[in-house]
C-alpha cells in the first residue's frame, strides 16, 4: 500500500512493475489493426494513440488487456502517473 510506503522505497529509478492499468473508453476491440509493412508485427500503441497517456511515467501496452499501463517515475502515482505522491 503506497499510503504506508516508506519514502526511501520510492527512491528507485523506475518501478519494477506497472503501478496501474487503465482501459480506455474507446478501445476499438473489433477492428483489425494493419500490420507493419512486411514485418508481420503490430506497432506499439504507446508510440501513437497513447503517446501522452502517462503524465509522469513510461507507457507499456498490455496486449492481453488491450490497454496501456504506466510505469511511474519516482515521486508519482496513479493510473496515469498523474499524482505527486512523494
Amino acid at each position: 500500500d503506497l499510503q504506508e510506503a516508506d519514502l526511501d522505497l520510492l527512491r528507485v529509478t523506475l518501478s519494477s512493475k506497472p503501478q496501474a492499468l487503465a482501459t480506455p473508453n474507446k478501445e476499438e476491440h473489433g477492428k483489425r489493426k494493419k500490420k507493419g509493412k512486411g514485418l508481420g508485427k503490430k506497432r506499439d500503441p504507446c508510440l501513437r494513440k497513447y503517446k501522452d497517456f502517462c503524465i509522469h511515467g513510461e507507457c507499456k501496452y498490455v496486449k492481453e488487456l488491450r490497454a496501456p499501463s504506466c510505469i511511474c517515475h519516482p515521486g508519482y502515482h496513479g493510473e496515469r502517473c498523474h499524482g505527486l505522491s512523494l
Partner: antibody, heavy 114, light 108 residues
C-alpha cells in the same frame, strides 16, 4: 547526498530576460523530474512547473506559461528556467526542487529594477 | 485548479501547547497527494509530512497529520520554540500542483 545549487541573486532591468540555473548532484539527474517554485517577499509558494530531464517534457502552471521556459542540460546536470519580459511582479525568490520534494535549492533572489 | 485554504493565517502559541492547522481543498483529493512543508525565516521550505500522515526523515514525532477528501490538518502535539515557522499544505492531485496560503506560527 542530493544537492541543488542555485546562484544567490540576480539583478535585472525591467523588460529584459533572465536564465536562472540549478545544478544538481548526488543522484541520477535524468531519473527525477525537477520543479520550480516562486516565492514573492513575505508571500506564499507558487508552483511554476516541472521538467523531465530525460526527455525535456514539461508541465506548466497556466499562469506562468508565457513567462517561464524550463530546459535542462544533461551533460552538466543543470536545470534552467528562463523568465521573459520581466516586471517588478517577477521580483521573488525562485527555488528548484527535486521531484520527491525533500530537497530544495537555496533559492535565487531575483530583483527586477531599473 | 485546486485551491487550498489554510487557517488560521497567523497564530501564537505557548511552549507545550497543542497546535492544529487546517487545510481545506476546493475539491476532493486523495490522501496520497496531500503534503505539508515547514519554512523557517530565511530558509528554503522543508518537507514535513507526505501523503497526509507520513513524517519525513528527521521530523520529530510531535508532528502529525490527518484528513481525507477536502479536509486535512497538521498537529503539533506540544509546541516548542524551534517550531516557529510558516507551514504550507500542498496538493499533488492535479496540475497545477498548488500550495496553501500558509500559516505563520509564532511563540507567545
Amino acid at each position: 547526498q542530493v544537492q541543488l545549487q542555485q546562484p544567490g541573486a540576480e539583478l535585472v532591468k525591467p523588460g529584459a530576460s533572465v536564465k536562472l540555473s540549478c545544478k544538481a548532484s548526488g543522484y541520477t539527474f535524468t531519473s527525477y523530474w525537477m520543479h520550480w517554485v516562486k516565492q514573492r517577499p513575505g508571500q506564499g509558494l507558487e508552483w511554476i512547473g516541472e521538467i523531465n530531464p530525460s526527455n525535456g517534457r514539461t508541465n506548466y502552471n497556466e499562469k506562468f506559461k508565457s513567462k517561464a521556459t524550463l530546459t535542462v542540460d544533461k551533460s552538466s546536470s543543470t536545470a534552467y528556467m528562463q523568465l521573459s519580459s520581466l516586471t517588478s511582479e517577477d521580483s521573488a525568490v525562485y527555488y528548484c526542487v527535486w521531484s520527491l520534494f525533500d530537497y530544495w535549492g537555496q533559492g535565487t533572489t531575483l530583483t527586477v529594477s531599473s | 485548479e485546486i485551491v487550498l485554504t489554510q487557517s488560521p493565517t497567523t497564530m501564537a502559541a505557548s511552549p507545550g501547547e497543542k497546535i492544529t492547522i487546517t487545510c481545506s481543498a476546493s475539491s476532493s483529493i486523495s490522501s496520497n497527494y496531500l503534503h505539508w512543508y515547514q519554512q523557517k525565516p530565511g530558509f528554503s521550505p522543508k518537507l514535513l509530512i507526505y501523503r497526509t500522515s507520513n513524517l519525513a526523515s528527521g521530523v520529530p514525532a510531535r508532528f502529525s497529520g490527518s484528513g481525507s477528501g477536502t479536509s486535512y490538518s497538521l498537529t503539533i502535539g506540544t509546541m516548542e520554540a524551534e517550531d516557529v515557522a510558516t507551514y504550507y499544505c500542498q496538493q499533488g492531485s492535479s496540475i497545477p500542483f498548488t500550495f496553501g496560503s500558509g500559516t505563520k506560527l509564532e511563540i507567545k
